[in-house]
């Protein structure tokens, strides 16, 4: 049974130019995660963290993806494009797969505010 | 074709090492993961460990800890496995085996779909 | 680490009879469980992944089911070419092997 649950940094602003750092926190589980994948918004890998192996950063984002801060990863150089949905996927064992999901703004706005607080989706 | 071509068969002392290499072909290399197996004769298969062909991390069995090294060289497309002070218990076949799962489908599978022909070890003084 | 355990070690069959191969984990491993096919002298070959997944140009008289602990392989129709040594295989880390199961010609 999967007793987890996936906790996100929610929905986010950043500014052009700026760099984010998307966040998700698997809790209420004693599931050992196996790899945590990070998708853009038309579902294509920006990144890997495979428990074993470590990052794997897509060639096509190297330049602009970071890994990290522990199993999340942060997005640099923003541009308009960025702007859409994350989704981060927990491979569990035994539970499973667990999805969270984050929604990001790119404000062209120097006053964009980048919000760090956890939501459950 | 999609392939793995190892090195030949070795003899080799008790207290020795050996290097057994694995040469990919017909896929981007540094997309996937290379396990190694082996196979003493007459017995079952025996996971080693693996490495990333993407940024050289490696994981081993425990067994082997400290007496195996995997290593890539990406300019080559090969993979490498090294092991230390050699005993009889040792005498294998040697597989390599590519991981199912590209790092880029995101699927853990932990599954091996193509492997190397072998090469035999023979432990022997 | 888990433990896999094949049954039966080997067994009896004839051309044509259906065959069933069971994999037991020593602990949960979801669908984490993969199958070979390994002949005398050769390389295994992957026939199944993720409990019930078809490898590729593999024929379809082969099939897998199971998840959790229990595991099966199973082959509809048994040919000629089918009389080898069967591996399962889980991936939760470490991955592990089970002891294999020989079928040969009765």
């Known amino acids: 049974m999967m007793t987890g649950t996936i906790e996100t940094t929610g929905n986010i602003s950043a500014k052009k130019g700026g760099s984010v750092i998307l966040q998700c926190h698997l809790s209420s589980t004693m599931a050992q995660v196996t790899q945590v994948n990070w998708e853009q918004h038309d579902h294509s890998l920006l990144a890997i963290r495979n428990a074993e192996l470590g990052w794997h950063i897509y060639p096509a984002f190297k330049d602009r993806v970071a890994p990290g801060p522990g199993l999340g990863l942060t997005l640099q150089s923003l541009t308009m494009n960025d702007t859409g949905e994350y989704f981060c996927t927990y491979h569990t064992y035994p539970d499973g797969t667990y999805r969270g999901r984050i929604f990001l703004e790119v404000l062209e706005s120097s006053v964009a505010e980048h919000s760090a607080r956890f939501q459950i989706p | 074709q999609v392939q793995l071509v190892q090195s030949g068969a070795e003899v080799k002392k008790p207290g020795a090492s050996v290097k057994v290499s694995c040469k990919a072909s017909?896929?981007?290399?540094?997309?996937?993961?290379i396990s190694w197996v082996r196979q003493a004769p007459g017995q079952g298969l025996e996971w080693m460990g693996w490495i990333s062909a993407y940024n050289g991390n490696t994981k081993y069995a425990q067994k082997l800890q400290g007496r195996v090294t995997m290593t890539t060289d990406t300019s080559t497309s090969t993979a490498y496995m090294e092991l230390r002070s050699l005993r009889s218990d040792d005498t294998a076949v040697y597989y390599c085996?590519?991981?199912?799962?590209?790092?880029?489908?995101?699927?853990?599978?932990?599954?091996?779909?193509?492997w190397g022909q072998g090469t035999m070890v023979t432990v022997s003084s | 680490d888990i433990q896999m355990t094949q049954s039966p070690s080997s067994l009896s069959a004839s051309v044509g009879d259906r065959v069933t191969i069971t994999c037991r984990a020593s602990?949960?491993?979801?669908?984490?469980l993969n199958w070979y096919q390994q002949k005398p002298g050769k390389a295994p070959k992957l026939l199944i992944y993720?409990?019930?997944s078809l490898q590729s140009g593999v024929p379809s008289r082969f099939s897998g089911s199971g998840s959790g602990t229990d595991f099966t392989l199973t082959i509809s129709s048994l040919q000629p070419e089918d009389f080898a040594t069967y591996y399962c295989?889980?991936?939760?880390?470490?991955?592990?092997f089970g002891g294999g199961t020989k079928v040969e010609i009765k």
């Open positions: 295989q889980q991936s939760v880390p470490p991955r592990t």
């Open positions: 017909g896929y981007t290399f540094t997309s996937y993961a």
């Open positions: 993720a409990a019930s």
């Open positions: 602990q949960s491993i979801s669908s984490y």
């Open positions: 085996a590519r991981d199912l799962s590209s790092f880029w489908s995101g699927d853990v599978l932990g599954a091996f779909d193509i």
